[in-house]
């Protein structure tokens, strides 16, 4: 999905933002949009957002899905609206996990999100949807 070469004056895209790094916003602007899914203590954590600088998302977007984390990236206004990241499965897609509020950890590094807040706290997820 992404060009191999860094782009200096790359266009900024509007992206759907869902999850902890979004605060009260439902969108963000960046050079790439993403949709991600990871597992935390048996529960799914979904997030959507943007990489504000191309290089920040380059490695994350190239990482193949693992049993514990998947990230899908795209370029285009609102391109992540209908993307739901899925973990790889072997045959039967058991098991899934529930999207409840969690007390710990994250799925994409703070550097990837340009220093936006990433720690998942009970209070954060009580007040915000966390996909």
């Amino acid at each position: 999905v992404e060009d191999e070469k860094p782009k200096v004056n790359q266009k900024l895209y509007m992206c759907v933002c869902e999850g902890l790094s979004c605060g009260n916003e439902d969108h963000c602007e960046g050079q790439q949009c993403f949709s991600s899914l990871s597992i935390n203590d048996g529960f799914h954590v979904y997030q959507k957002g943007c990489f504000q600088v191309y290089e920040q998302g380059k490695m994350t977007c190239k990482t193949p899905p693992s049993p514990g984390q998947a990230v899908e990236c795209c370029q285009g206004d609102w391109c992540n609206r209908n993307i739901t990241a899925q973990l790889p499965t072997k045959g039967k897609s058991f098991p899934g996990t529930q999207n409840f509020h969690l007390e710990e950890q994250k799925l994409i590094s703070e550097e990837d999100l340009g220093g936006e807040q990433k720690l998942i706290s009970e209070e954060d997820l009580h007040h915000h949807h966390h996909h």
């Epitope: 759907v16 869902e18 203590d41 048996g42 529960f43 799914h44 979904y46 959507k48 209908n82 739901t84 899925q86 897609s93 058991f94 098991p95 899934g96 996990t97 529930q98 999207n99 409840f100 509020h101 969690l102 007390e103 997820l125 009580h126 949807h129 966390h130 996909h131």
Partner: antibody, heavy 116, light 108 residues
């Protein structure tokens, strides 16, 4: 084969207690969150409670909060639901399920009847 | 709490028919919507997760679509074993996790 088997249901008087169990096999139990979902006779599905893989986080529907306690013993691959102060409206088939963004798989269910 | 409303509540159809069941959320739930089939005396069975992903082992005549607040479950050509009750379930928000009230699919 992935399997969930509930037990512990039965007839109990209002105000009484019961403990349901759900024995899991065929997967690494401790890795996954689990839930209880119930279905009153002739009615729809109602989520009751959930617990994280480690057991460190628990969640309840408002209708059972303070009366029901979910727990798990990962060494025994077993999920529990302790039910106290039971009410007639708690009468239902109780299912345990691997707790996804979707629920899958489900156990066969155990019937709890609260009646005087 | 997010409310899920299914329509119709009951539906009569014949073998071979194309059937559509709808589910509406009281607020946007992105694509975090799942569908189940339940037959009398049996546990529910997952059909579709994340709005449109077909669960392994489920026949391809079942499909799901939608995003935001409006979702559909479609059975392209109804088979005798498809007569059952169908439920939608949202997994967008923190608890409570909520189900639709169910749609009973009966033989015409």
């Amino acid at each position: 084969e992935v399997q969930l088997v509930e037990s512990g249901g039965g007839l109990v008087q209002p105000g009484g207690s019961l403990r349901l169990s759900c024995a899991a096999s065929g997967f690494t139990f401790s890795t996954y969150a689990m839930s209880w979902v119930r279905q009153a006779p002739g009615k729809g599905l109602e989520w009751v409670s959930a617990i994280s893989g480690s057991g460190g986080s628990t969640y309840y529907a408002d209708s059972v909060k303070g009366r029901f306690t979910i727990s798990r013993d990962n060494s025994k691959n077993t999920l529990y639901l302790q039910m106290k102060s039971l009410r007639v409206e708690d009468t239902a088939v109780y299912y345990c399920a691997n707790s996804p963004s979707w629920f899958d798989p489900w156990g066969q269910g155990t019937l709890v009847t609260v009646s005087s | 709490d997010i409310q899920m409303t299914q329509s119709p509540s009951s539906l009569s159809a014949s073998v071979g028919d194309r059937v559509t069941i709808t589910c509406r959320a009281s607020q946007s739930i992105s694509s975090y919507l799942n569908w189940y089939q339940q037959k009398p005396g049996k546990a529910p069975k997952l059909l579709i997760y994340a709005a449109s992903s077909l669960q392994s082992g489920v026949p391809s005549r079942f499909s799901g679509s939608g995003s935001g607040t409006d979702f559909t479950l479609t059975i392209s050509s109804l088979q005798p074993e498809d007569f059952a009750t169908y439920y939608c379930q949202q997994s967008y928000s923190t608890p409570p996790i909520t189900f639709g009230q169910g749609t009973r699919l009966e033989i015409k």
